[in-house]
């Protein structure tokens, strides 16, 4: 009886099971009863990354400068290249297509975690007791100045934005 | 049990025609492909043609393309090879084989064709 | 086509030796080859099927290896009706092809 299903790392055509082609190879024939699957490895700059029947080797993937993206790791026979971003910027997606720049955390926000190659800059407001009064990709929200361990006074409350201003202490004369 | 018994070979002219016929038996003809190899005296095997078990794919090496012809008869249980404008180089014995597992897993007697004037 | 190259043309070995044929394709053929035994006046028979796997009915002392370009035909210990001529045969693709054949003959 005609096979209706096939073993794993097989397919079904004309009534038989054929060997699927390796990772890094292409399908050129079909197998026959009398002969297996003929296929071929894929090219320079081309790829199969699964057991296939595929009669054309993907493309890898260009990492084009002019959007921002260099090569993290070169493509091989059967992997795709992987693109990053060049410093400075991230991906814009997880297939990493292009790339924007990081964005700064503005006075009042501090990096809570520093963007790379593939996720951007997260920001948080700095809380009670930390300020920060640059627009920065890196900079944290810094403890406002204890005036009391320099054995000075707050003379001027500090905000998110601002340290706070010593003073020296009003003398009892 | 397994039988492929080849007749048809004889001593033919060059130029002229010779068809082999090979009776199989012991086992569900139309279910297998079936090929022809022959051997020169004293020389190594060489693959001539084969069919596929429904009759629908044959397969022929570029020298005898054209030439040769592979059929089957699967009501008679009787595979066929029509060869025409013999030539010399055609004296071999000729064997008939079943594909099995993609392999030639049985094989016949073989018949001796002569192609002398 | 797929050139397939055995090697030696005879090998001379004495019953109870061991001896190792080898058959070399002219490009990869992964492991889509055959072996078969022919004894003077006989037709082939399959041996090997698929570079190592064992055919039912085949003595335990034929065994096959390789994969790619380089394979070995091993008969373990030679027994006198194994003096015979061995083919290989390569299925990967069109048109069939065989080696030319390894005589081993009684030294």
């Known amino acids: 009886e005609p096979p209706t299903a096939c073993r794993e790392k097989q397919y079904l055509i004309n009534s038989q099971c054929c060997s699927l082609c390796q990772p890094g190879q292409k399908l050129v024939s079909d197998c026959t009863e009398f002969t297996e699957t003929e296929c071929l490895p894929c090219g320079e700059s081309e790829f199969l990354d699964t057991w296939n029947r595929e009669t054309h080797c993907h493309q890898h993937k260009y990492c084009d400068p002019n959007l921002g993206l260099r090569v993290q790791q070169k493509g091989t026979s059967e992997t795709d290249t992987i693109c990053t971003c060049e410093e400075g910027w991230h991906c814009t997606s997880e297939a990493c297509e292009s790339c924007v720049l990081h964005r700064s955390c503005s006075p009042g926000f501090g990096v809570k975690q520093i963007a790379t190659g593939v996720s951007d800059t997260i920001c948080e407001p700095c809380p009670v007791g930390f300020f920060s009064n640059v627009s920065s990709a890196f900079e944290k929200c810094h403890p406002w100045t204890s005036c009391e361990t320099k054995d000075l006074v707050v003379q001027q409350a500090g905000t998110n934005k601002t340290d706070v201003v010593c003073g020296p202490q009003d003398r009892l004369r | 049990e397994v039988q492929l018994v080849e007749s048809g070979g004889g001593v033919v002219q060059p130029g002229r025609s010779l068809r082999l016929s090979c009776a199989a038996s012991?086992?569900?003809?139309?279910?297998?492909?079936m090929s022809w190899v022959r051997q020169a005296p004293g020389k190594g095997l060489e693959w001539v043609a084969s069919?596929?078990?429904?009759?629908?794919?044959?397969y022929y090496p570029d020298n005898v393309k054209g030439r040769c012809t592979i059929s089957r008869d699967n009501s008679k249980n009787t595979l066929y090879l029509q060869m025409n404008s013999l030539r010399a180089e055609d004296t071999a014995v000729y064997y008939c084989?079943?594909?099995?597992?993609?392999?030639?897993?049985?094989w016949g007697q073989g018949t001796l064709v002569t192609v002398s004037s | 086509e797929i050139v397939l190259t055995q090697s030696p043309a005879t090998l001379s070995l004495s019953p109870g030796e061991r001896a190792t044929l080898s058959c070399r394709a002219s490009?990869?053929?992964?492991?889509?080859l055959h072996w078969y035994q022919q004894k003077p006046g006989q037709s082939p028979r399959l041996l090997i099927n698929?570079?190592?796997q064992s055919i039912s009915g085949i003595p335990a002392r034929f065994s096959g290896s390789g994969s790619g370009t380089d394979f070995t035909l091993t008969i373990s210990s030679l027994e006198p009706e194994d003096f015979a001529v061995y083919f290989c045969?390569?299925?990967?693709?069109?048109?069939?092809?065989f080696g030319q054949g390894t005589k081993v003959e009684i030294k």
């Open positions: 084989t079943r594909a099995g597992g993609k392999a030639m897993d049985y």
């Open positions: 012991g086992f569900t003809f139309s279910n297998y492909g």
């Open positions: 069919i596929s078990s429904g009759g629908d794919d044959t």
């Open positions: 490009q990869s053929i992964r492991d889509n």
């Open positions: 698929y570079a190592s």
């Open positions: 045969q390569q299925f990967n693709s069109w048109p069939l092809t």
